[in-house]
């Protein structure tokens, strides 16, 4: 997704507009400590990474503090002084929002309103997936804010819910990542349950963006 050159595969993730993680997979340099050099401005000198990720004792990535930046990350992955991959990327197009926090459920007869804390930046979709033991697939509903009302539920059934946040593709493009799912919460007759007892092993949720 971040590109490949000279056998180097790159992945970029911008965690919640706070931290950028650049990882690489370089089969040609599998036993080499590649170094990561970067800048956030085209005019600055390159800085070297101070927070490397290691895999089997060798560098495999870098974590950078990048609070609320919408600029370009210029970077070079080097073997000694030799650049093996050089690129520049707008960081926001690799956004991974944080998982929803303070998820709450408000029941009213056959409907539930799921709310959580909206993130501080926009152009996001808040997706609720839910299913009862009688559903073969997860159902899904999403809104622009974390205030999602699901109607037509059966008060007698137990439902499992979880929530995640996604970046709008028309704004951020196709290379973003959905947030991690919130914890699964089970409800029946407007009351929280430890689990939906008769639930078979749930199928994988739909991961479509």
């Amino acid at each position: 997704q971040g590109g490949a050159a000279e056998g180097v595969q790159i992945q970029i993730i911008y965690f919640n507009l706070e931290t950028v993680q650049v990882t690489w997979n370089a089969s040609k340099y599998s036993r080499t400590n590649l170094t990561f050099h970067y800048r956030f401005n085209g005019d600055e000198a390159y800085d070297q990474c101070t927070n490397y990720l290691l895999q089997e004792g060798h560098t495999s990535g870098c974590l950078l503090d990048a609070e609320q930046r919408d600029d370009i990350l210029y970077f070079s992955i080097r073997n000694g002084t030799h650049p093996v991959f050089t690129a520049s990327r707008w960081m926001v197009y690799y956004l991974k929002p944080s998982s929803p926090k303070h998820v709450r459920f408000s029941w009213h007869q056959d409907a539930v309103t799921v709310t959580c804390s909206d993130l501080s930046y926009g152009d996001l979709l808040y997706e609720v997936q839910y299913r009862s033991p009688f559903d073969t697939e997860w159902q899904s509903k999403q809104e622009n804010t974390c205030n999602v009302t699901i109607e037509g539920l059966d008060a007698e059934k137990c439902y499992s819910f979880w929530v995640r946040v996604k970046a709008m593709e028309d704004v951020y493009g196709p290379d973003t990542y959905p947030s991690d799912w919130s914890e699964v919460t089970c409800w029946q007759r407007g009351e929280i349950r430890d689990a939906c007892a008769e639930t078979p092993t749930p199928p994988k949720p739909k991961l479509s963006k």
Partner: antibody, heavy 118, light 106 residues
Framework: EVQLLESGGGLVQPGGSLSLSCAAS????????MHWVRQAPGKGLEWVSA????????YYADSVKGRFTISRDNSKNTLYLQMNSLRAEDTAVYYC???????????WGQGTTVTVSS | DIQMTQSPSTLSASVGDRVTITCRAS??????LAWYQQKPGKAPKLLIY???SLESGVPSRFSGSGSGTEFTLTISSLQPDDFATYYC????????FGQGTKVDIK
Amino acid sequence: EVQLLESGGGLVQPGGSLSLSCAASGFTFSRYGMHWVRQAPGKGLEWVSAISASGGSTYYADSVKGRFTISRDNSKNTLYLQMNSLRAEDTAVYYCAKDKWGYAFDIWGQGTTVTVSS
Amino acid sequence: DIQMTQSPSTLSASVGDRVTITCRASQSISNWLAWYQQKPGKAPKLLIYKASSLESGVPSRFSGSGSGTEFTLTISSLQPDDFATYYCLQYNHYSTFGQGTKVDIK
């Protein structure tokens, strides 16, 4: 309809200044990085400058660094290029263009002509 | 800086021909390449991005391929509206255009 409309081009003497504007409509301007690209008469395309969606970060080709300044006013949906110390080689049609997810420039204006001549 | 070399510079073809334009990067750019069409007096129009993704609204006779340093734009059956100049653009590190390929009538 998504549209970009440049203005401000004209004839200027070497060493002079000019300010170009680009009015955006039909999309949420404040969400996207923007660029200026130029094309000298009978020549190919040359990227000139870019600015991030918030306007907080700017980027320039070496050929214009220190002479040109890109800026934007998201409240007015307008992109600007202030050109100082103009040279004959800056003569070109100047296009503003919208960034497409860091892959390319997807929407272009019709261009405005800048002629630097004594 | 990354240099982009297009070939040929000029290409004479007839309606219905299959046309291929190549673009070579001076270093690997993965698939960070776009193709544009420009007609005289008009702004460039995006055809292909990320080497092979067809921009919305662009006819399917246009296709792109390649990765690394070698890229190709193919027009499967040239139409009268396709006579124009075509440019490649690398967007891997900064932005650099190829010098252009003019497709004219044979």
